[in-house]
Interface confidence: low
């Protein structure tokens, strides 16, 4: 019988008492085969973290800073359940640390040196740790003691709780630096008042502070937020302009064998019986013998943290950056304006080989990082382990939802000013064998389908989005008799036609022979009835243009396109017979890397782009014998995006809406994780 006990870690006598009450009340409402609570008492949160890592306890609720400690080796804990605040309809699990300034003050984030600063309090998250952590490497040396470095960076400050004797500049704007509400500039509202009164130039607070202190929109409009990319935004655009997004209070567990499903089952039942306004005798979010015992008193309930989410993704790049800087206190010897090497994310073995060749040829400008799936690559770019990769539109959508930005677009048509003119897109098509003359768009049910991969534009999002509108359910594996859609569940009928061996079967990378445009077409040639690809796929793999044994004798005339009106047309008539226009593949990166990725890639394509005539003896960035490694092989250049520099603008309203509709059918664990951080 599996042990269904969750050992909760308590850090004080009062917490232990509440834990025992929690245990006893859960026993009274949960059947004997359900989850139960046991209580383990430790002296501190760090002791609880160690106890969970050592399998002496299972769960504890932590503030963000401690979630970071819990994640670090050797603890390796992960977030499993989040407390939420506000309403069930609009649950808030995060707050945003922001830098507020007056509208007419005219400086940016990189011009804070010499300004006057208002802080909520020394050592507090939004008011000190995050802003000072992010500014850490810009502080004058020596950076220890930190208070002295901060005092020398700003021209004056109010940092309540600082030592006014040793660091008088930190108390210049609030004599005495009082550490309570007796100091008018203490806390969130106090730091904002410090700015409002004109004592300081910038206040480091949380996003809700300005709304709580200024009910009138006209008054709020006198203030702006400083963004990390050295721009400013209105105060209500905090989701796009903040220093960090911080989880409020989170239950953590072991990464391996951590009972996360059991913990969720327990807490979900607990909130049903003892959550807000549920029971008089025991309340989960109330602490008669103290404050915030086990859980925050202000919490309204729990949300399950998506399983794909590790602590780095949960805490976010900016927060982890800030805390690491403060904890480790190390900076590059001499930060230069020169760009660091761009770490390109390569999918599996084949892409890695090409990437390594690029790296050598780039003489240190490009480095390579490997991952097994596109989603793993996106996650690595998010957390800083990698910097960039080129993505199909479907993954540009996921990357965008995860906070990444498009920086350059692949162009597929030769033109005089290729790099200046991003194209409208390519065509997603449905290809069939000419010999299967009775097959149309309207009678695909029960046929064998070939897809580039789940989540990709031409191979999945467009055809399955159209299909969803027709059948109104997500059971595509029932609609087709079998198929190959790399990235599907291994036991799905949509993996049955795939050709990868062993663990590589149906994997969304080149280890699966039917992956990608060429792979999906090969699947049609060898096994399938219909392939969902791009309009260039058939000509690129017929007439001897692909020398591989399966393709060398193929003839374009033996294939036709399915049109949405139920007719069929020759392959070259794609402009009048396609499923939809698809956005070109695009390079994505983190916002902070945007300028460097743009600069280095433009240099690289001038060296190794389509201007290289002989690819047999030289490295060619856009060639890989029809395998579309790193970039599509038909890429002519990487083009500037001009103002289409967000994923919504780049993909276009129509495509974003189509993919949004298909999200009901999404199996993307990364998309689930990212929409948890930003619904």
């Amino acid at each position: 019988v599996p042990d269904k006990t969750v050992r909760w870690c308590a850090v004080s006598e009062h917490e232990a008492t509440k834990c025992q009450s929690f245990r006893d009340h859960m026993k009274s409402v949960i059947p004997s085969d359900g989850p139960s609570v046991a209580c383990v008492k430790k002296a501190s949160y760090l002791d609880c973290i160690r106890a969970i890592a050592a399998n002496e306890a299972d769960a504890v609720t932590l503030d963000a800073g401690l979630v970071y400690d819990a994640y670090l080796a050797p603890n390796n804990l992960k977030p499993v359940v989040a407390e939420f605040y506000g309403s069930k309809e609009d649950p808030q699990t995060f707050y945003y640390a922001v830098a507020v300034v007056k509208k007419d003050s005219g400086f940016q984030m990189n011009q804070l040196r010499g300004k006057k600063s208002c802080h909520t309090g020394l050592g507090r998250s939004a008011g000190w740790n995050i802003p000072i952590g992010l500014l850490y490497c810009d502080l004058p040396e020596p950076r220890k003691p930190l208070e002295k470095a901060v005092a020398n960076f700003f021209s004056g400050s109010c940092a309540p709780c600082a030592d006014g004797t040793d660091f008088p500049q930190l108390c210049q704007l609030c004599p005495g630096c009082g550490c309570s509400t007796l100091n008018q500039y203490f806390g969130y509202s106090g730091a904002f008042k410090c700015l409002k009164d004109g004592a300081g130039d910038v206040a480091f607070v949380k996003h809700s502070t300005i709304f709580e202190n200024l009910a009138n929109k006209a008054d709020r409009d006198q203030y702006e937020l400083l963004c990390l990319d050295n721009t400013r935004k209105p105060v209500d655009e905090y989701k796009d302009c903040h220093l960090a997004q911080v989880p409020s209070h989170t239950v953590v567990a072991r990464s391996m064998g951590g009972k996360e499903d059991l913990i969720w089952e327990l807490l979900n039942q607990a909130q049903e019986h003892f959550g807000k306004d549920k029971s008089k005798e025991f309340q989960l979010f109330s602490s008669p013998h103290g404050k915030d015992l086990l859980f925050k008193d202000s919490a309204h309930g729990f949300l399950k943290v998506p399983p794909r989410m590790d602590a780095k993704m949960y805490l976010g790049y900016e927060y982890v950056t800030a805390i690491r800087n403060l904890r480790e206190g190390t900076c590059p010897e001499a930060p230069t304006d020169e760009c660091k090497p761009v770490k390109w994310c390569a999918l599996s073995h084949h892409e890695r080989l090409k990437c390594d060749e690029w790296s050598v040829n780039s003489v240190g400008k490009i480095e390579c990082v490997s991952a097994e799936t596109t989603e793993d690559c996106i996650a690595k770019i998010m957390n800083g382990e990698a910097d960039a990769m080129s993505l199909d539109g479907g993954f540009v959508y996921i990357a965008g939802k995860c906070g990444l930005v498009p920086v350059l677009a692949e162009n597929y048509n030769k033109s005089d000013n290729c790099e200046d003119t991003p194209e409208a897109g390519y065509f997603a098509i449905a290809v069939v064998k000419k010999s299967a003359s009775d097959l149309t768009w309207d009678n695909l049910k029960g046929k064998k389908s070939c897809h580039t991969a789940v989540g990709r534009t031409a191979g999945w999002n467009i055809p399955m989005g159209l299909l969803y509108n027709k059948i109104n359910h997500c059971r595509f594996d029932e609609f087709f008799s079998e198929g190959c859609a790399p990235g599907s569940k291994k036991d799905s009928s949509l993996c049955k036609l795939c050709m990868g061996s062993g663990l590589n079967l149906c994997e969304p990378n080149n280890k699966e022979g039917y992956y990608g445009y060429t792979g999906a077409f090969r699947c049609l040639v060898e096994k399938g009835d219909v392939a969902f690809v791009k309009h260039q796929t058939v000509p690129q793999n017929t007439g001897g243009k692909n020398p591989d044994p399966w393709a060398k004798n193929l003839n374009e005339k033996d294939y036709e396109l399915l049109c949405l009106d139920g007719t069929r047309k020759p392959v070259e008539e794609y402009a009048n017979c396609h499923l939809a226009r698809a956005p070109n593949h695009a390079v994505v990166t983190r916002k902070d890397k945007e300028a460097c990725v743009h600069k280095i890639l433009r240099q690289q394509q001038h060296l190794f782009g389509s201007n290289v005539t002989d690819c047999s003896g030289n490295f060619c960035l856009f060639r890989s014998e029809t395998k579309d490694l790193l970039f599509r092989d038909d890429t002519v250049c990487l083009a500037k995006l001009h103002d289409r520099n967000t994923y919504e603008k780049y993909l276009g309203e129509e495509y974003v809406k189509a993919v949004g509709n298909l999200r009901k059918c999404s199996t993307s664990s990364l998309l689930e994780a990212c929409t948890f951080r930003r619904p």
């Epitope: 950056t321 590059p332 790296s359 050598v360």
Partner: nanobody
Framework: QVQLVESGGGVVQAGGSLRLSCVAS????????MGWYRQAPGNQRELVAA???????NYADSVKGRFTISRDNAENTVYLQMNSLKPEDTAVYYC????????????????WGQGTQVTVSS
Amino acid sequence: QVQLVESGGGVVQAGGSLRLSCVASGSVFSIDAMGWYRQAPGNQRELVAAMTNAGSTNYADSVKGRFTISRDNAENTVYLQMNSLKPEDTAVYYCNARSKLIARINNPYEYWGQGTQVTVSS
């Protein structure tokens, strides 16, 4: 944190050879690249050779063909084999490790050893 300890420095005649070693300890899982820098009196610290986890290498022009960098990932050690040494190679040689974990926005962390003196006499 990552700690780096160099060894193998010393005095050698021009044309001779030396092999420097650097052992990393601490959060070695975070290391993305290791390398060697040197600083001669009155000069800035300069790159000698570096090697990423993926095996990509980078050498200063002045040492190409004479110096070879290698890594033993299992032992968390980086080596610098220095052949055909010249008097102008005289400097303090520093081991460097760069962390791939999130650091300052846009800048990876760098860790440094204490340095080991290499003197090439003519």
